[in-house]
């Protein structure tokens, strides 16, 4: 659900951390309409997710930890 690199809505699916290689934060005050986490998957798809949802926060935390430990 994205247009010109902006997420316009959120996925209705839950993704597993093993499917995700990284993420980008989209901020509503930086040219896009909504806040979002854009997950980048192993299938080279970009998935727009709701940053308020617990499962999204969990994956962001996991990935952030991984980066810190590198």
């Amino acid at each position: 659900a994205s247009n010109f690199d902006c997420c316009l809505g959120y996925t209705d699916r839950i993704l597993h951390p093993k499917f995700i290689v990284g993420f980008t934060r989209q901020l509503a005050n930086e040219g896009c309409d909504i806040n979002a986490i854009i997950f980048h998957t192993k299938k080279k798809l970009s998935v727009c997710a709701n940053p308020k949802q617990t499962w999204v926060k969990y994956i962001v935390r996991l990935l952030s930890k991984k980066v810190k430990n590198m």
């Epitope: 993704l15 597993h16 093993k18 499917f19 192993k42 308020k52 949802q53 617990t54 499962w55 969990y58």
Partner: antibody, heavy 120, light 107 residues
Framework: QVQLVQSGAEVKKPGASVKVSCKAS????????MHWVRQAPGQGLEWMGL????????NYNQKFKGRVTLTVDTSTSTVYMELSSLRSEDTAVYYC?????????????WGQGTLVTVSS | DIQMTQSPSSLSASVGDRVTITCGAS??????LNWYQRKPGKAPKLLIY???NLADGVPSRFSGSGSGRDYTLTISSLQPEDFATYYC?????????FGQGTKLEIK
């Protein structure tokens, strides 16, 4: 110890709705998902959906096309599963089960099951 | 939706046998796979999570392996209490889907 206690067996007529409860104890209720899985006679396991008690987020199997609704009462650590427009194929044992991020999204504790019979 | 296919659908074996159950996914699920055991009249029990990790309290005769689309549950030496139905489950992406089950019976 972790316990999930479900409500008792139900007999319903086709077209009716059923609401099954699942009361959790022995762990921090808002830290884990609650899934619902069913097993019809002679069939395999089927995932119906989940609810996150911390933010009431729900995710449903579209196979049920809006017939299933999951709700939560955090004050009593209880999750409810309502299935509407019942048909004979909905006759099954319904389970609530805890979803755990820590075991790779596995379902690590299960309720005892609730038999729902749909019959005219 | 991701489809999960188990084989065989039923299996006869004896106490002490080594048994292997396979599970295939319709696409790569990157190890996001769990195994459950179900006995008649009882709730399912988590055996293996993340394709290879043994759940708490599960005997070490159970093991899981695999990657990509193909996964295996192995019981190294069957015990009388192991006769049950086994299910694999995809947790890569919702809807979470189960295999149709493998019923393990006494020969």
């Amino acid at each position: 110890q972790v316990q999930l206690v479900q409500s008792g067996a139900e007999v319903k007529k086709p077209g009716a709705s059923v609401k099954v409860s699942c009361k959790a104890s022995g762990y921090t209720f808002t830290s884990y998902w609650m899934h619902w899985v069913r097993q019809a006679p002679g069939q395999g396991l089927e995932w119906m959906g989940l609810i996150d008690p911390s933010d009431k987020y729900t995710n449903y199997n579209q196979k049920f096309k809006g017939r299933v609704t999951l709700t939560v009462d955090t004050s009593t650590s209880t999750v409810y599963m309502e299935l509407s427009s019942l048909r004979s194929e909905d006759t099954a044992v319904y389970y609530c089960t805890r979803g755990n991020y820590g075991v790779d999204y596995g379902m690590d504790y299960w309720g005892q099951g609730t038999l729902v019979t749909v019959s005219s | 939706d991701i489809q999960m296919t188990q084989s065989p659908s039923s299996l006869s074996a004896s106490v002490g046998d080594r048994v292997t159950i396979t599970c295939g996914a319709s696409e790569n699920i990157y190890g996001a796979l769990n195994w459950y055991q179900r006995k008649p009249g009882k709730a399912p029990k988590l055996l293996i999570y993340g394709a290879t990790n043994l759940a708490d309290g599960v005997p070490s005769r159970f093991s899981g392996s695999g990657s990509g689309r193909d996964y295996t549950l192995t019981i190294s030496s069957l015990q009388p209490e192991d006769f049950a139905t086994y299910y694999c489950q995809n947790v890569l992406i919702t809807p979470y889907t189960f295999g149709q089950g493998t019923k393990l019976e006494i020969k």
